[in-house]
């Protein structure tokens, strides 16, 4: 019994004066608490508590269930205890079959003994199955058997408390361990689509998938910069133990322009939080925006190829696309395809392939596209660069020499005179008159230039060269002159192509 200094309140004393008492089933339990300020006896076993206000606790015929801790308390709140074992060969264990453990924590298998003198107090697997190799436990006859550091792998483990009595193994009722997982990572969250584009009045529905080890994961849809509680629906599944999935679906049945914004799916557990966002854009009506991928004014050399390429945004999906030239629709030579295979893609590409263009094929090429809401178009002005071609070169009745050349860009005509048999015509001659003949027409075809010089300026035999040139190339025509007396005669004019 405890000893206390005089003057200080002392704990009650119990008779018999020992910490443990063993009685046989059917025998009497008689416990006396001596204290001037006696208050009560308390009996505890397996979370059950009984009280007795008499200073003597008497149980005439002890049963196994009378096994437990008897505590006497005085008015000062001081107490003293004795543990009583009621030995019953037919009931070696008192059990509370509830067995829950939290991962990485210890948990108590509540199977206290009624006889502390049995041996080999331990745990055994059900139906002779071995316990997991890493399962460690500490037996305590008064409390039960403590499993150390519970693992997830022990979930739904079936086990018995076991003792050896007279050389035989005796098992308790079975226990099924239920393990609550520890959250060791943030929830995994994903969203059905990262962005949504809708017209007013259409339904907006987006699903967030939350995955975790337990259904005790919190999740919610939030509107960024808003506290409004959003209406969401849940579906959930357990794909086996510790593999939980929840789908939280947010719906706005008739979206409005002011519903546009960022929506966040937020989830948290005791480890931490995670979130994912989706963007909603609501437009009052559909649209098409066209972006040329090359300059809308195109210069291309005669005989070469060119690709007219546009990208365009279309919402809703484009329904009709066409390329037109001179009021004629191309049936082939073009392709139209989405920029990406993404479900939310609204960007498309259209390409018109023009091959071996002729000088006559310059002009306006138009791309037209439409959807259920709008039409849109873009025009490309295509200029075909052609080497000058000398159309006519004549000596006119008024004594003028005239050269007419066509090409694109507009050719420049220069004149040269070569005396005698010189091959190189270097002395330039200024023209009397230069005219662009078809400047009033459409600017896509070849441009025609006419240039004239006065042949009376030439006093000697020789050759006159008319040279037409532009960025693409040059072409020359020659007039040969011979003087017979006072007469000047034009001998066959001819052209020479000079690359």
């Amino acid at each position: 019994q405890p000893s206390v200094s005089p003057g200080e309140p002392s704990p009650p004393s119990i008779h018999p004066g020992k910490s443990d008492l063993i009685v046989r089933v059917g025998d009497e339990i008689r416990l006396l608490c001596t204290d001037p300020g006696f208050v009560k006896w308390t009996f505890e076993i397996l979370d059950e508590t009984n009280e007795n206000k008499q200073n003597e606790w008497i149980t005439e015929k002890a049963e196994a269930t009378n096994t437990g801790k008897y505590t006497c308390t005085n008015k000062h709140g001081l107490s003293n205890s004795i543990y009583v074992f009621v030995r019953d060969p037919a009931k070696l264990f008192l059990v509370d079959r509830s067995l829950y453990g939290k991962e990485d924590n210890d948990t108590l298998v509540r199977c206290p003994l009624t006889d502390p003198e049995v041996t080999n107090y331990s745990l055994k697997g059900c139906q002779g199955k071995p316990l997991p190799k890493d399962l460690r436990f500490i037996p305590d006859p008064k409390a039960g058997i403590m499993i150390k550091s519970v693992k997830r792998a022990y979930h739904r483990l079936c086990l018995h408390c076991s003792v050896d009595q007279e050389g035989k193994s005796v098992l308790s009722e079975k226990f099924i361990l239920k393990v609550r997982p520890a959250f060791k990572a943030v929830p995994v969250v994903s969203v059905s689509k990262a962005s949504y584009l809708l017209r007013e009045g259409e339904e907006f529905t987006v699903t967030c998938t939350i995955k975790d080890v337990s259904s005790s994961v919190y999740s919610t849809w939030k509107r960024e910069n808003s506290q409004t509680k959003l209406q969401e629906k849940y579906n959930s599944w357990h794909h086996g133990d510790f593999n939980y999935e929840r789908q939280a679906t947010l719906t706005i049945s008739s979206a409005r322009v002011n519903d546009s914004g960022v929506f966040m799916c937020y989830a948290n557990n005791t480890f931490g939080s995670a979130n994912v966002t989706t963007t909603l854009e609501v437009v009052d009506k559909g649209f098409i925006n066209i972006f040329p991928m090359i300059n809308t004014t195109v210069f291309v050399n005669d005989g070469e190829n060119v690709d007219l390429i546009v990208e365009y945004e279309a919402f809703p999906k484009p329904e009709h696309q066409q390329w037109i030239y001179m009021n004629r629709t191309f049936t082939d030579k073009w392709e139209d395809y989405p920029k990406s295979e993404n479900e939310s893609n609204i960007r498309y590409v259209s390409e018109l392939h023009l091959t071996r263009l002729k000088g006559t094929e310059g002009g306006t090429y138009t791309f037209l596209v439409s959807n259920s809401d709008v039409n849109a178009a873009i025009a490309f002005n295509v200029y075909v660069n052609t080497k000058p071609e000398i159309l006519t070169y004549d000596r006119l009745v008024n004594g003028m020499l005239q050269c007419v050349a066509a090409g694109f860009p507009e050719p420049t005509i220069d004149w040269y005179f070569c005396p005698g048999t010189e091959q190189r015509c270097s002395a330039s001659v200024l023209p009397v008159d230069v005219q662009t003949l078809n400047s009033s027409g459409p600017p896509f075809g070849k441009l025609v230039v006419q240039s004239s010089i006065d042949s009376s300026a030439f006093k000697h035999n020789g050759t006159v060269e008319c040279k037409a040139y532009n960025d693409v190339g040059k072409t020359s025509a020659y007039f040969n002159f011979a003087f017979k007396g006072n007469n000047k005669e034009q001998i066959h004019p001819h052209t020479l192509f000079t690359p």
């Epitope: 509830s98 239920k178 609550r180 005790s216 357990h238």
Partner: antibody
Framework: QVQLVQSGAEVKKPGSSVKVSCKAS????????ISWVRQAPGQGLEWMGG????????NYAQKFQGRVTITADESTSTAYMELSSLRSEDTAVYYC????????????WGRGTLVTVSS | DIQMTQSPSSLSASVGDRVTITCRAS??????LNWYQQKPGKAPKLLIY???SLQSGVPSRFSGSGSGTDFTLTISSLQPEDFATYYC????????FGGGTKVEIK
């Protein structure tokens, strides 16, 4: 042995709320799943929702989402179920039971609380 | 939600009879199926968990089988105290119970 002890019968007016309690005597209440299951007169069983006190997050059946609130007080080992906007169809026996979350079976039941909704 | 369909909704049997109750899930629930017995004015009582495991203290005449979508509760030899209503319950998704099977005395 652990027991679940529920609060007494209630009579409520339509539109009002009711809060039923469920006290667990002993055991590791903290990591139990405590669920609420109701049974209308002559009808079957209907799960309303549940909570694991240690985690503090309640799960609700879709049908009751927004109308039921399940909480737990670890210090008193007591779980609560509050049902709002009561209507006559909510007249039922409301049971608390251990289990019902994370694939737990209902291995322990309270005796039930009769809630009568009548004007 | 996963629908649980129990059949029959009621049956009449005599003491000593072998009784079989079936429960069908609208989609696979693996083995997450439990069976309960309920007597009038009382709370339900767990009989079988995880489709086939017998709860402690429940007589061995009760047995459960099945997995996926089809499950069976069998009472091998009906006793007077077994006249009650039996419910199945799935635990894969939001918990749902079958409509119940009332076992009455013939």
């Amino acid at each position: 042995q652990v027991q679940l002890v529920q609060s007494g019968a209630e009579v409520k007016k339509p539109g009002s709320s009711v809060k039923v309690s469920c006290k667990a005597s002993g055991g590791t209440f903290r990591i139990y799943a405590i669920s609420w299951v109701r049974q209308a007169p002559g009808q079957g069983l209907e799960w309303m929702g549940g909570i694991i006190p240690d985690f503090g997050v309640a799960n609700y059946a879709q049908k009751f989402q927004g109308r039921v609130t399940i909480t737990a007080d670890e210090s008193t080992s007591t779980a609560y179920m509050e049902l709002s906007s009561l209507r006559s169809e909510d007249t039922a026996v409301y049971y608390c039971a251990r289990g019902g979350l994370d694939t737990d079976e209902f291995d322990l039941w309270g005796r039930g609380t009769l809630v009568t909704v009548s004007s | 939600d996963i629908q649980m369909t129990q059949s029959p909704s009621s049956l009449s049997a005599s003491v000593g009879d072998r009784v079989t109750i079936t429960c069908r899930a609208s989609q696979s629930i693996n083995s997450y199926l439990n069976w309960y017995q309920q007597k009038p004015g009382k709370a339900p009582k767990l009989l079988i968990y995880a489709a086939s495991s017998l709860q402690s203290g429940v007589p061995s005449r009760f047995s459960g089988s099945g997995s996926g979508t089809d499950f069976t509760l069998t009472i091998s030899s009906l006793q007077p105290e077994d006249f009650a209503t039996y419910y199945c319950q799935q635990g894969v998704s939001d918990i749902t119970f079958g409509g119940g099977t009332k076992v009455e005395i013939k």
